[in-house]
Amino acid sequence: GITIPRNPGCPNSEDKNFPRTVMVNLNIHNRNTNTNPKRSSDYYNRSTSPWNLHRNEDPERYPSVIWEAKCRHLGCINADGNVDYHMNSVPIQQEILVLRREPPHCPNSFRLEKILVSVGCTCVTPIVHHVA
Amino acid sequence: GITIPRNPGCPNSEDKNFPRTVMVNLNIHNRNTNTNPKRSSDYYNRSTSPWNLHRNEDPERYPSVIWEAKCRHLGCINADGNVDYHMNSVPIQQEILVLRREPPHCPNSFRLEKILVSVGCTCVTPIVHHVA
């Protein structure tokens, strides 16, 4: 990216922890206003690799509640509605940023944390290992 | 975890913007150390709803680089390797947190932002609308 001069209105950065400790405004700006409101909310049932959603709550994390996908079957649903074990249902995982209260139980101090979440499932052709 | 009285080591919360403006330590703690490093990195090719990955870079955002999935086909790949248009490839989307520099170009001041990203694709049975 192109380097742009430092904004003179930036907060003071003389903190001894700078630049590792920063100020963050928690009033979330939502960039998703023009998206289809339905989004992927019914795909978990209609997919050939359907999944269930499990609620994970951690009050020390921001966001506190994350819904995680767990594939329903090892195989995939075929045209007859049966599970085909020649194919595999696998979770699609993504590394996301969350904020972790640090020190614990503090309302106004956090540390960035990366966690791996399963967002949904997809149907893949298995990797077949042939024995020599 | 067990609730402990509000930690006396919490940063001062007398800021006029409290609790909306918080301190965040950017030294990222990675909770994913025990995960399979391969993860879903080859699923985009092996899926019956394959996708391409597109790089999205924004220097005003943290993380500045996000890889987004775009489904390759409208339909899904069948057992013969052909696209079956009786099924649909659809993106699995997730709302994630990012940090947006605010004011712009400041190294130590951010605002939380929610963005919708496509993580991968799944194959779904289409919703058929019957005309009366």
């Epitope: 979330i28 939502n30 409101p37 989004r39 909310s41 019914d42 978990y44 049932n45 959603l53 499990h54 609620r55 709550e57 951690d58 009050p59 020390e60 921001y62 966001p63 506190s64 509640v65 994350i66 819904w67 139980h105 309302p107 | 975890g1 067990i2 609730t3 009285p5 509000r6 709302e95």
Partner: antibody
């Protein structure tokens, strides 16, 4: 102004089903889960389950043994609670309440006005 | 399920009194406690969240404390509008459970 407005009182026969609605306004519907809590006459509060309008995820109190179904319609910002195989002990006031997914510290801050369900033969 | 036991189940007090209501969890694997106030015919109103914090618009005479399995709601100086039923709720262990309630009446 945040509001959760529930549907009106219902009188049902044992064995039938009831569906209570909860229309949300004044906030982004998908940023919050909807939890359902009931209160039998003269009794305490009982958590029934939670629905995430964004993902479609649901989690139920096992006590209800599969009789509860929670759904939501994003297009109308309305959550629904359906209770089947009704029995007399399901006579209660049913409440919806919102719960922030972002910060548990903001849980159950706004409640609907309650819907009275009477089960009687 | 974690049981939340409130004590006392009912309490008579006078305006100006200091009142304490306790809530004990059957195990210590909860994350925190919320406290609610309910008046007859009305929906519950959140008073305290995350064990200690005062909900928006709640007078400072209400306070919360506790850790492990034992939690407390304190009203430092009772006002006429405080006579109601109070419930604790545990967060962090499914299903989320409420205490059986404490009815606070005028002496």
């Amino acid at each position: 102004e945040v509001q959760l407005v529930q549907s009106g009182a219902e009188v049902k026969k044992p064995g039938s089903s009831v569906k209570v609605s909860c229309k949300a306004s004044g906030y982004t519907f998908t940023d919050y889960e909807i939890h359902w809590v009931r209160q039998a006459p003269g009794q305490g509060l009982e958590w029934m389950g939670v629905n995430d309008p964004e993902s479609g995820g649901t989690f139920y109190n096992q006590k209800f043994d599969g009789r509860v179904t929670l759904t939501a319609d994003e297009s109308t910002s309305t959550a629904y609670m359906e209770l089947s195989s009704l029995r007399s002990e399901d006579t209660a006031v049913y409440y919806c309440t919102r719960y922030s997914k972002w910060d548990s510290f903001d849980g159950m801050d706004y409640w609907g006005q309650g819907t009275t369900v009477t089960v009687s033969s | 399920d974690i049981q939340m036991t409130q004590s006392p189940s009912s309490l008579s007090a006078s305006v100006g009194d200091r009142v304490t209501i306790t809530c004990r969890a059957s195990s210590g694997i909860i994350s925190y406690i919320d406290w609610f106030q309910q008046k007859p015919g009305k929906a519950p109103k959140r008073l305290i969240y995350a064990t200690f914090d005062l909900a928006s618009g709640v007078p400072s005479r209400f306070s919360g404390s506790g850790s492990g399995t034992d939690y407390t709601l304190t009203i430092s100086s009772l006002q006429p509008e405080d006579f109601a039923t109070y419930y604790c709720r545990q967060v962090g262990s499914y299903p989320e459970t409420f205490g059986q309630g404490t009815k606070l009446e005028i002496k």
